[in-house]
């Protein structure tokens, strides 16, 4: 028979032979031959391979470096990498989560639209008319201006996006 030019799924072609790939969690020790099946060995502690493969070395699990604000979200196995996330109050700088930065605070005049998570930063939005924020915060939303009317008071000083309205008593001298 003619030597194969293509192999089945989970096989690879070497020396005109179709060899079985190693399953996830195992590395290649020896290619198959005319006389032998592919030889694979399990990855060691703190190593992984996440695909059917012919790698001769397993990959090292990612290290969640506390000095970079990282902690383990999910421990790696022989088939999966460790997943890192950031300590409370911090978030990842990239999808790979290789380092963390402090959550951004929303300045006065801006409120929190979406609170930060371990993987995403705070999203701020400008306080619209009728709302204000007078603090720099990573949690506070824009607050509505006080309704003077409901307190039987009148607006003495108009609100801004950074300040609440100031209410005062009604003018009793009116006819």
């Amino acid at each position: 028979p003619e030597p194969p030019t293509a192999c089945r799924e989970k096989q690879y072609l070497i020396n005109s032979q179709c060899c079985s790939l190693c399953q996830p969690g195992q590395k290649l020790v020896s290619d198959c031959t005319e006389f032998t099946e592919t030889e694979c060995l399990p990855c060691g502690e703190s190593e992984f391979l996440d695909t059917w493969n012919r790698e001769t070395h397993c990959h090292q699990h990612k290290y969640c470096d506390p000095n970079l604000g990282l902690r383990v979200q999910q421990k790696g196995t022989s088939e999966t990498d460790t997943i890192c996330t950031c300590e409370e109050g911090w978030h990842c700088t990239s999808e790979a989560c290789e380092s963390c930065v402090l959550h951004r605070s929303c300045s006065p005049g801006f409120g929190v639209k979406q609170i930060a998570t371990g993987v995403s930063d705070t999203i701020c939005e400008p306080c619209p008319v009728g709302f204000f924020s007078n603090v720099s915060s990573a949690f506070e939303k824009c607050h509505p201006w006080t309704s003077c009317e409901t307190k039987d008071l009148v607006v003495q000083q108009a609100g801004t996006n950074k300040t609440d309205v100031v209410c005062g008593p009604q003018d009793r001298l009116r006819a």
């Epitope: 020790v29 031959t33 005319e34 032998t36 099946e37």
Partner: antibody, heavy 115, light 112 residues
């Protein structure tokens, strides 16, 4: 081209050890196991075992496990088979062989065990 | 260990005629991966072995097409369609499905 060249004939006394070498050339040494087979005079063939030069991993015929040692020196692309506590029944031609993209045999090393 | 039994022990043949050697194993040589690791090789007088066939029926490069292998499970055959003078020697079957690898006792092919 692929070649396996073995060391010369040996004459040993019972109880002694012998170390046979097999120098490989013409291919990447660490890419293929080296296996050892012996053929006693007028007898059949016996598989002794094999070694993976990449990591030194071995597999053996249980019959030889306690007496045979397989090693490699990757710096000189050479495999070794040492057989200890020799007996007269160990008199044989010892072959190294490599397979994968063809099968290649050394020329054989005659080991004679005689008092 | 898997016992490999060859027959006949000796096979006198006429040049140009066919020859057939049988090899039986004491257990199935079908590997869990679907391959059957049964092989044939030739040893001419005073020479190292030379492999002819691997995995039942695959000829090694450079092996003449007058050599063919067949069989499955425990029963295997090597055929030489037209024997030539250079085919004289001992033919062995071997299996590498099970450890330890084992060999048949050999069949001596000689010219009548």
């Amino acid at each position: 081209q692929v070649q396996l060249v073995q060391s010369g004939a040996e004459v040993k006394k019972p109880g002694a050890s012998v170390k046979v070498s097999c120098k490989a050339s013409g291919y990447t040494f660490i890419s293929y196991y080296i296996y050892w087979v012996r053929q006693a005079p007028g007898q059949g063939l016996e598989w002794i075992g094999g070694i993976n030069p990449r990591n030194g991993g071995t597999n053996f015929n249980e019959k030889f496990k306690s007496r045979a040692t397989l090693t490699v020196d990757t710096s000189i692309s050479t495999a070794y088979m040492e057989l200890s506590r020799l007996r007269s029944e160990d008199t044989a031609v010892y072959y190294c062989t490599r397979h994968g993209n063809g099968v290649y045999w050394g020329q054989g090393t005659t080991v004679t065990v005689s008092s | 260990d898997v016992v490999m039994t060859q027959s006949p022990l000796s096979l006198p043949v006429t040049l140009g005629q066919p020859a057939s050697i049988s090899c039986r194993s004491s257990q199935s040589l079908l590997h869990s991966n679907g391959n059957t690791y049964l092989h044939w090789f030739q040893q001419r007088p005073g020479q190292s072995p030379r492999h002819l066939i691997y995995q039942v029926s695959n000829r090694f490069s450079g092996v003449p097409d007058r050599f063919s292998g067949s069989g499955s499970g425990t029963d295997f055959t090597l055929k030489i369609s037209r024997v030539e003078a250079e085919d004289v020697g001992v033919y062995y079957c071997s299996q590498t499905t099970h450890v330890p690898w084992t060999f048949g006792g050999g069949t001596k092919v000689e010219i009548k």
